[in-house]
Every structure is written in C-alpha cells, then in structure tokens.
Interface confidence: medium
C-alpha cells in the first residue's frame, strides 16, 4: 500500500467526516466483503454534519481486512485515548484506510487542533496546498500554496504542517496564514524532553 | 520481462476436477495480491477473488465462495485456480492479474495472456 | 450484479473523437477519484489504460485520457484509429468485489 503527503488541511478539505473518537477493541472481519469494522466511541464531530444529516453518531470506522489492501492497523491498546479521524463516508458508513489521517489528538500541535476545529474549512473549495517533492517546483495557480515542509524538513511533518494554513488572502489569491501557536515545537534545531 | 504467464486451454466433462496455473516474473510476487477474473463466452468481467501470496491471505467474492478455490506457491511464484466439480456453466475464459493498491484505489496492472476453460460432456 | 452502467456501444469514424461514459453513485465513483478504464481487443486479455481517473501507464497513447464529473467517469479517446476498435470497462473501488466492473461498451470503428 502506497500513500502520498498529505497536509492536515488537504486531508481535512477531501474528507467527508472528520471526528474525534476512541477506538473500543479488535476489529470485527465482515464476511462476504473485503472489509473489516472497529467500534468506535465519537466525542467530537468536526466535519461532515450536512453529511450526516439525522445520524447522531458512528459506532464503526471500516476499513480494508488487510494493511496490504491499505487497511488500517489500529496498534493503540488504550482505550481511553482520543483520535483525530479524517474519513470517508459510504452509504451511512465511516470509512477509512492506511491513508487516513489518522492521529492521537494530543500528538496534533495546538495549531492543528484549532485549525482542524475552526481554520482549515475556510480554505476547503478555494485554496489548494501543493506539494513541492523535488526541486524545482512552482506555483501552478494563485489559489495554491507551494507546499516545501518534504523539501526543507526531509519529512511530511515540519513548519507548513503543523503551524500553517492556506487560506484566501483574497478572492482571488490564497497564502499560507500562521495559526496564531508558538512555533517553538517544530523548529529543526529542538530537541525533544526526555 | 514484467509478466504473469497462464497454463493452457483445457477442455473436460462436467464433474471432473481442474486446476489452472499463473505464474509472475520480472516482480516480487510475494508483494502483490494476485485476482482472478472469469469472462464468459460474449459477457463482461467479473472478479472471482484475489490472493496475496506472500501469506496466501485469499478473499472470494460472494458469488464465487465455496464454488472454487484459490491458492498460491511463493516458492515458484505461481497461482491457482481449481474446480473440484466442473460444471458446463464454468465455461469461460479465465484471467489472472496483478492488482494494485493505494488508498482507496485497486485496480489491475498486468495481466496473464488468459486460460480458456471448456467444459462440455 | 452490476454497479457501473456504461452503453453498451459507442461509434466513430477514424480521426473523431469519442467519449464513453461510467456512471455510478457518491459512494464508488463520485465519492473518489479512483476510477480505471480497461481495452480489450477480441480475444486478448484487457490492458490498463487509465487509472486514478485520468492517469495513464506507461506506453499508453496520449489519444486516451480520462475524466470524472459527480458521479459519471469518462474515458475520451481522441484522433480515433482502426486499432482502437474494442470493449472498454470501467472499474472502480467498491466494497463488494463483485461490483467493481462496469458491463462494458463496444466502441466501433467505423
């Protein structure tokens, strides 16, 4: 299974739902397809309520049975953990793979949780974040944001990921707009506590 | 070369047994689910089931579960399609292919020449 | 059991341009930019011609490209030669696996 970068607000934009949610056990093979279903327990939702419509919730995360079929692995024993979960939605049903944006809540940055709460949806549908993975790479339009964290960090996960959101500056130009946290957590020269 | 080579055309009774073969080179065939797809005389494609022969974890779809059996050998990296009991409406052209995997997409790749099964009393 | 529904044939004359259609619903083709056109000429084995919508492997003709509109996917094969003469399928992702395929369309070469 091969998934491509993903910036949390590309993720958010194509996603159906976005929750916040605990996962409850072991997956449950359903037989006849090529699926199988955690429990899930939602505490948040964040996108996808015009979606929903009348549902109050999702009790099940599908996914592919096996992590060669991108499905997801959920390797969390604790039960009690929240997750961010960016998923899709298919007849009435959450659904989501290896390629998910799939995360503890509290490994998000408090950037990315307040973007992922109120932010990135300002840019869903007019702005576009774009990956740079080689140099060189230029802006193909002025409603995109050159993406450069794989460039300059070596890793999807650097200034533009976890500080950053692409936004209009106006209607015709979109930039990459701080999210108003200390940036002191992803700087390349600091060391994480031990 | 990249390729997945079928055995021959076979032509047996109702009732008797067959198994047809696909073999891979020129890729890791431990790394790629193996599918099988049945094209009846005239008719569409449909997917019978795939295999991942690096563990010989196998899915059927639902119309083909328990009508045949799908099964691989990693050591000549080689596919299997068997009958146990023939029947005249298993007649078709048989396909094996190589299914890619990202995300939410699975789509074939390559493909084996075909295996035409005639079964006829 | 079919999910895709394509016409089940398509003309053009040599040099036109053609397009053939894939129509499913928001949870196969329209909820995902993950559709697959297939070639299969009278007595061979298919052959990819375009994957992820509108992707093509490589050795195949710049002639043949894919599009996707809400619920429709398209396949436009343009500067139509004798040699495109064949069925077409579209594929997409399902949960059924049964369901993947569309039935097909005969594009003729007129």
């Known amino acids: 299974c091969s998934c491509a970068p993903t910036h949390p607000q590309t993720a958010f934009c194509n996603s159906d739902l976005v929750i916040r949610a605990k996962f409850m056990g072991s997956p449950e093979i359903i037989e006849t397809t090529l699926y199988q279903r955690y429990e899930i327990k939602m505490t948040k939702m964040l996108k996808g309520f015009d979606a929903v419509g009348n549902a109050t919730g999702f009790r099940f995360a599908y996914t592919p049975a096996m992590e060669s079929l991108c499905g997801y692995v959920h390797k969390s024993q604790n039960r009690s953990e929240e997750f961010l979960i960016a998923g899709r939605l298919r007849n009435g049903n959450l659904h989501i793979t290896a390629c998910s944006f799939l995360v503890p809540w509290h490994n998000l940055s408090p950037a990315q949780q307040k973007a992922f709460v109120k932010t990135y949806s300002a840019g869903c549908g007019v702005c576009t974040v774009f990956p740079c993975s080689a140099i060189p790479c230029k802006l193909e339009s002025d409603s995109h944001c050159l993406w450069t964290d794989q460039i300059l960090m070596g890793s999807e996960k650097g200034y533009q990921s976890d500080h950053f959101a692409c936004l209009p500056r106006n209607p015709d130009l979109c930039t990459w707009q701080y999210l108003g946290v200390s940036m002191t957590r992803s700087l390349p020269l600091a060391k994480a506590e031990a | 070369q990249v390729q997945l080579v079928q055995s021959g055309a076979e032509v047996k009774k109702p009732g008797e047994s067959l198994k047809i073969s696909c073999k891979g080179s020129?890729?890791?065939?431990?790394?790629?689910?193996i599918g099988w797809v049945r094209q009846m005389p005239g008719k569409g494609l449909e997917w019978m089931g795939i295999?991942?022969?690096?563990?010989?974890?196998?899915r059927y779809s639902p119309s083909f579960q328990g009508q045949v059996t799908i099964s691989a050998d990693k050591s000549i990296s080689t596919a299997y399609l068997q009958w146990s009991s023939l029947k005249a409406s298993d007649t078709a052209m048989y396909y094996c292919?190589?299914?890619?995997?990202?995300?939410?997409?699975?789509?074939?790749?390559?493909w084996g020449q075909g295996t035409l099964v005639t079964v006829s009393s | 059991d079919i999910a895709l529904t394509q016409p089940a044939s398509v003309s053009g004359s040599p040099g036109q341009s053609i397009t053939i259609s894939c129509t499913g619903t928001?949870?196969?083709?329209?909820?995902?930019?993950?559709v697959s056109w297939y070639q299969q000429h009278p007595g061979k084995a298919p052959k990819l011609m375009i994957y992820?919508?509108?992707n093509r492997p490589s050795g195949v003709s710049n002639r043949f490209s894919g599009s996707k509109s809400g619920n429709t996917a398209s396949l436009t094969i343009s500067g139509l030669q004798a040699e495109d003469e064949a069925d077409y399928y579209c594929?997409?992702?399902?949960?059924?696996?049964?369901?993947?395929f569309g039935g097909g369309t005969k594009l003729t070469v007129l």
């Open positions: 594929q997409s992702y399902d949960i059924m696996p049964e369901r993947v």
């Open positions: 928001s949870s196969d083709v329209g909820g995902y930019n993950y």
């Open positions: 020129g890729y890791s065939f431990t790394s790629y689910w």
């Open positions: 295999i991942y022969p690096g563990d010989s974890d196998t």
């Open positions: 992820d919508v509108s």
């Open positions: 292919a190589r299914l890619r995997v990202h995300d939410y997409a699975m789509y074939f790749d390559l």
